[in-house]
């Protein structure tokens, strides 16, 4: 008789999980000189007894802490690139501005980008049927708590003129329930951030609306302004020029406003 | 000028309702984060309530969370605070302030009083 | 009793120097924005001291403010006798989300 299996509303864990987590593990090891001495093998096993055996809707940061010792990674303070809605610009971003990181630039972070997992109480198995979704399930499930886990780690890390990129296409550019708005914005240290830049990325060519003076934004401003962290904003009208830009500073059109 | 004005304060009674408001002029009122801070008699300032630039998020002291409720209409330059199942410690004069970013609560109303007695 | 510390009373002469302090915690004083208030008899509280240390406009040189780790203090130097009010601390509190003040404290010239 097979044993009842809780149906979850969101998708299950992503196929190969435990090999994909392993692989890139030995991946970032190898192309990041200062992250050489991690052992794969005990990430995956923290990793794993973080959700294994546990149930999904009960995970808390503590299940995460032999991880996050494990991965434990210094990052250059003052060049930390926070994003919102927006990853696939930010990591395109990172990728030529080599000496910026998102959090999905550190190990911890790259080993779950994409990802989903969980497992179910009392057992040592993992559900690839389905895992809990964060609105109609339980906030507190595995893949949930992780990124706040690691979010907030990453924000308080943060130090002198921290950048967020913003989507100027979504009605809520600043949106206070994103992971940026939940949870990086309040842990961002006021003794050590001055100044929290926001990029707001414009989605139309021939949107010339200055975005940063959206309700939202100015919500963020006044949140920010609470913390005493000084707050500035720039649009950035052309996202495909501002890229090339970054690939190319001197070439001339690169003077004018991106 | 800039200026806050709160009206429909007034006497009630315990488990009943009033609804505050408070008109804006002089300023762009949907730029700021506007709140409700009330003063008991003879006591201190006490924060009451807050609701973000767009209306979406809204904070409240613990004394009053679930009883009050603040909203906004920014095409009226007006707040409001709904006031249900009210007690005798929420006898108060109450005042409006807007929050202007790195200054503080900065610009006040002149206050509504609200009694609460049998 | 009110999240952030004030002296009841102060006290002093015309022309002399007062000082009221303000102590709070981490969650508060220490890495949020700190203001004080100046509320005169039968009127609604005025903004004094805005981001801890500057006085918005209209406000006297005489009014000065200072921050310190968890504590904050207001000097109010060449006290008249219009400075007679009460003055309260106020600051955001990120734990608590919300707008804290202190106790007040009421302001004499003798």
């Known amino acids: 008789v097979p044993r009842w299996r809780q149906q979850w509303s969101g998708p299950g864990t992503t196929k190969r999980f435990p090999e994909t987590v392993l692989a890139r593990c030995v991946k970032y090891t190898e192309i990041h000189p200062e992250m050489r001495h991690v052992d794969c093998q005990s990430v995956w096993d923290a990793f794993k007894g973080a959700f294994i055996s546990k149930h999904p809707c009960n995970i808390t940061e503590e299940d995460y802490q032999p991880l996050m010792k494990l991965g434990t990674q210094t990052v250059p303070c003052n060049k930390i690139l926070l994003w919102s809605r927006i990853k696939d610009l930010a990591h395109q971003f990172t990728q030529v501005q080599r000496d910026m990181f998102t959090l999905e630039d550190t190990l911890l972070g790259y080993l779950a980008d994409d990802l989903t997992w969980c497992g179910e109480f009392n057992t040592s198995k993992i559900n690839y049927q389905s895992c809990p979704d964060w609105r109609k399930d339980c906030s507190n499930n595995p893949v949930s708590v992780f990124w706040k886990t690691v979010s907030r780690r990453f924000a308080e890390a943060a130090c002198d003129v921290v950048h967020v990129m913003l989507n100027g296409s979504r009605s809520k550019i600043f949106d206070k329930n994103s992971t940026f708005g939940s949870v990086e914005v309040h842990n961002l240290q006021p003794e050590k951030v001055q100044t929290l830049e926001a990029w707001v990325i414009h989605g139309g060519r021939e949107d010339s609306r200055d975005l940063c003076q959206d309700p939202t934004i100015k919500e963020l401003e006044s949140i920010i302004s609470k913390r005493n962290i000084q707050f500035s904003c720039k649009n950035i009208y052309r996202p495909d020029k501002f890229l090339q830009c970054v690939k190319n500073p001197e070439d001339s059109s690169c003077t004018s406003e991106i | 000028e800039v200026q806050l004005l709160e009206s429909g304060g007034g006497l009630v009674h315990p488990g009943g309702s009033l609804r505050l408001s408070c008109a804006a002029s002089?300023?762009?009122?949907?730029?700021?984060?506007m709140n409700w801070v009330r003063q008991a008699p003879g006591k201190g300032l006490e924060w009451v309530s807050s609701i973000s630039i767009t209306g979406d998020f809204t904070y409240y002291a613990d004394s009053v969370k679930g009883r009050f409720t603040i909203s906004r209409d920014n095409s009226k330059n007006t707040l409001y605070l709904q006031m249900n199942n009210l007690r005798a410690e929420d006898t108060a004069v109450y005042y409006c302030a807007n929050y202007k970013s790195y200054y503080g609560l900065d610009v006040w109303g002149q206050g509504t009083t609200v009694t609460v007695s049998s | 009793q009110s999240v952030l510390t004030q002296p009841p009373s102060a006290s002093g002469t015309p022309g002399q120097r007062v000082t009221i302090s303000c102590s709070g915690s981490n969650s508060n004083i220490r890495y949020n924005l700190v203001n004080w208030y100046q509320q005169l008899p039968g009127t609604a509280p005025k903004l004094l001291i805005s981001?801890?240390?500057q006085r918005p406009s209209g406000v006297p040189d005489r009014f000065s403010a200072s921050k310190s780790g968890t504590s904050a203090s207001l000097a109010i130097s060449g006290l008249q006798s219009e400075d007679e009010a009460d003055y309260y601390c106020?600051?955001?509190?990120?734990?608590?989300?919300?707008?804290?003040f202190g106790g007040g404290t009421k302001l004499t010239v003798l």
């Open positions: 106020a600051a955001w509190d990120d734990s608590l989300n919300a707008w804290v």
């Open positions: 002089g300023f762009t009122f949907s730029d700021y984060e």
């Open positions: 981001n801890n240390v």
